[in-house]
Interface confidence: medium
């Protein structure tokens, strides 16, 4: 027979039929089925099928009238070429039917990973996503949704390169993997999270630095007088996208909510397009980028704002230790500290004697006085960019007291 073999696909563990078109009234002498390596089965009318290969026992059957070959519990080893030799009664010529059997595994859910991000001109980003299915190598076709003009597929569809600006909508991309027996789709991937600093290092207005207080609200200014007439404003921070579209309330992408699942703490003012954050958290600190968009979704201008966040300082604690008291001179070491102050706290002591020694960011003070002199009353003031807090140290009865104390 000159025609190409019939291609049949089966699922690993499933069943498959290699069909023969033998009509009921055809008088058959016998049918021999030959497998990828050797003869498999012999069938004759009104007789039991003879199976010749051990590995097919219990998995192979030949249908009564059409003599089609049925294989169940398919293994990867079953794949290959099959041939049916059909011998009709009173018919000298043997008819042959050829088949090619492919056995495929059911696909698992495709995984999408970000391969690379390249920042290009005009504040745009080229993001390369890769789609793969665990355990599947051959015969897997990949496709992506949405199929956009500015997204290109390569490597048989498994790689998608998307070009986008912050002004483009952050669409969810879905990878669909397909083989002849199954089709699976990935979870949606928002590419906006991979491109949150396009062109930020090059150009745009160098915005100001804004100082905020932990737990309190803050406004990051954009100072767009005609904010209401702006098509769209997008603020980017880390993997968060906060946007305000014309004639619409400002919306925070689900990504922003991932930082605070209980409350939407971030929004864009419809008055001046500034970014407002309530109840500041330490992780809100960092560089923010604002992009003003045109109707055609291109970036018309960009501003950077750096947000610094500090705690309101609690009252400092003063600890002291007596170094030694002799010759009528009292010598002590003082240390001033603020709980949760962090490394941005500055300490000052007042009034400071000429011979006093201050060390370690001014938190430590060595001081001495004669018993004939007035006992110094010292004040430690802790300060950071958003607050100041003081504590007075009373030195009387120190030299006659215990070796260490806290005030």
């Amino acid at each position: 027979k000159d025609s190409a073999p019939t291609v049949v696909s089966g699922i690993l563990g499933g069943s498959v039929t290699l069909p023969l078109n033998i009509s009921v009234d055809t008088e058959i002498e016998n049918v021999i089925w030959i497998g990828p390596k050797n003869a498999l089965a012999f069938a004759r009318p009104k007789e039991n099928v003879t199976i010749m290969v051990k590995s097919y026992l219990g998995r192979l059957d030949i249908t009564k009238w059409s003599y089609s070959l049925c294989i169940s519990n398919l293994t990867l080893n079953d794949a290959g070429s099959y041939k049916a030799q059909i011998n009709q009664r009173n018919f000298e010529v043997t008819t042959e039917e050829e088949f090619t059997l492919f056995v495929y595994e059911q696909l698992q859910e495709p995984q999408v990973t970000m391969k690379s991000v390249k920042v290009s001109e005009n504040f745009s980003c080229n993001i390369t996503l890769m789609c793969s299915v665990k355990g599947a190598e051959k015969s897997v076709l990949y496709s992506w949704t949405p199929r956009e003009p500015h997204a290109s597929e390569s490597n048989g569809g498994s790689i998608l390169t998307v070009s986008r600006t912050p002004c483009d909508p952050d669409l969810p991309y879905i990878c669909t993997a397909q083989n002849p027996v199954s089709q699976r789709s990935s979870l949606p991937v928002h590419v906006g999270q991979f491109c949150t600093d396009p062109g930020a290092s090059r150009g745009g207005t160098t915005g100001e630095t804004v100082v905020g207080v932990l737990g309190e609200p803050v406004t990051l200014p954009l100072a767009l007088p005609a904010c209401r007439d702006t098509e769209k404003v997008v603020w980017l921070f880390n993997t968060s996208i906060i946007s305000k579209e014309r004639e619409e309330a400002a919306t925070a992408d689900p990504l922003i909510k991932s930082r605070d699942p209980y409350k939407n703490r971030v929004w864009v003012s419809s008055q001046d397009c500034s970014l407002k954050i309530s109840q500041l958290k330490i992780e809100d600190a960092g560089p923010y980028h604002a992009y003003v968009c045109s109707e055609a979704s291109s970036v018309t201008s960009m501003t950077h704002v750096t947000l610094l966040i500090y705690r309101r300082l609690r009252k400092p604690k003063i600890t002291w230790s007596l170094r030694h008291s002799e010759d009528g001179i009292c010598r002590i070491s003082l240390t001033c500290s603020v709980e949760d102050g962090g490394n941005t706290v500055m300490y000052t002591w007042t009034p400071l004697q000429k011979e006093a020694v201050v060390s370690q960011g001014e938190s430590h003070l060595n001081v001495s006085w004669r018993s004939s002199e007035n006992h110094p009353n010292l004040t430690c003031t802790a300060s950071n960019p958003v607050s100041r807090s003081s504590h007075q140290f009373l030195s009387e009865n120190i030299c006659s007291g215990p070796e260490r104390n806290t005030k």
């Epitope: 859910e109 949704t145 199929r147 997204a151 669409l171 699976r184």
Partner: antibody
Framework: QMQLQESGPELVKPGASVKISCKAS????????INWVQQRPGQGLEWIGW????????YYSEKFKAKATLTVDKSSSTAYMLLSSLTSEDSAVYFC?????????WGQGTTLTVSS | QIVLTQSPAIMSASPGEKVTVTCSAS?????MFWYQQKPGFSPRLLIY???NLASGVPVRFSGSGSGTSYSLTISRMEAEDAATYYC?????????FGGGTKLEIK
Amino acid sequence: QMQLQESGPELVKPGASVKISCKASGYTFTHYYINWVQQRPGQGLEWIGWIFPESGSTYYSEKFKAKATLTVDKSSSTAYMLLSSLTSEDSAVYFCARGTGFFDYWGQGTTLTVSS
Amino acid sequence: QIVLTQSPAIMSASPGEKVTVTCSASSSVSYMFWYQQKPGFSPRLLIYDTSNLASGVPVRFSGSGSGTSYSLTISRMEAEDAATYYCQQWSSYPPTFGGGTKLEIK
């Protein structure tokens, strides 16, 4: 046999809500996105949104964000669409359809009539 | 969103006649999909990825096009082809459909 079976016709009053169901069979329900499409009388087709049964994640067309809520029950392989604050404008046939990129299988449609 | 405009809106053809339905997109799309819908029934996928025939669709149907211009062709019209045909894109969100072309038999 791959099938999407939708719930029967609904007659509801303006202002009310309605929940339409779409029961899937013949394939692994959690592996495929379920989309919903509206067809108003004598009109064309309009996409409402999708839900991914495995995770429950959803995506809505801007037009239907405030109108439709999509959910699934994995145990019964059923997708649901809740339509709220109904007006006569919502009278239509609603189809569920499987797929991403295109819709390879469709439900038979549920006719919703909103009338006082 | 991308607007798909189909033409003609209504047309009739004799059995055996060649039929072409066009779909014009307001912005470039990468692929077009075509559906057939008969009265009282749900749509049926005919063509996917611009030119690939869906399972069970007769070979007299074909699709072509690129960019903003796409078409569906029936090489020889048959009585069972009388229906409304819709084009659809998913190159950008939201997915959109054309307004439909109603094809009648003469």
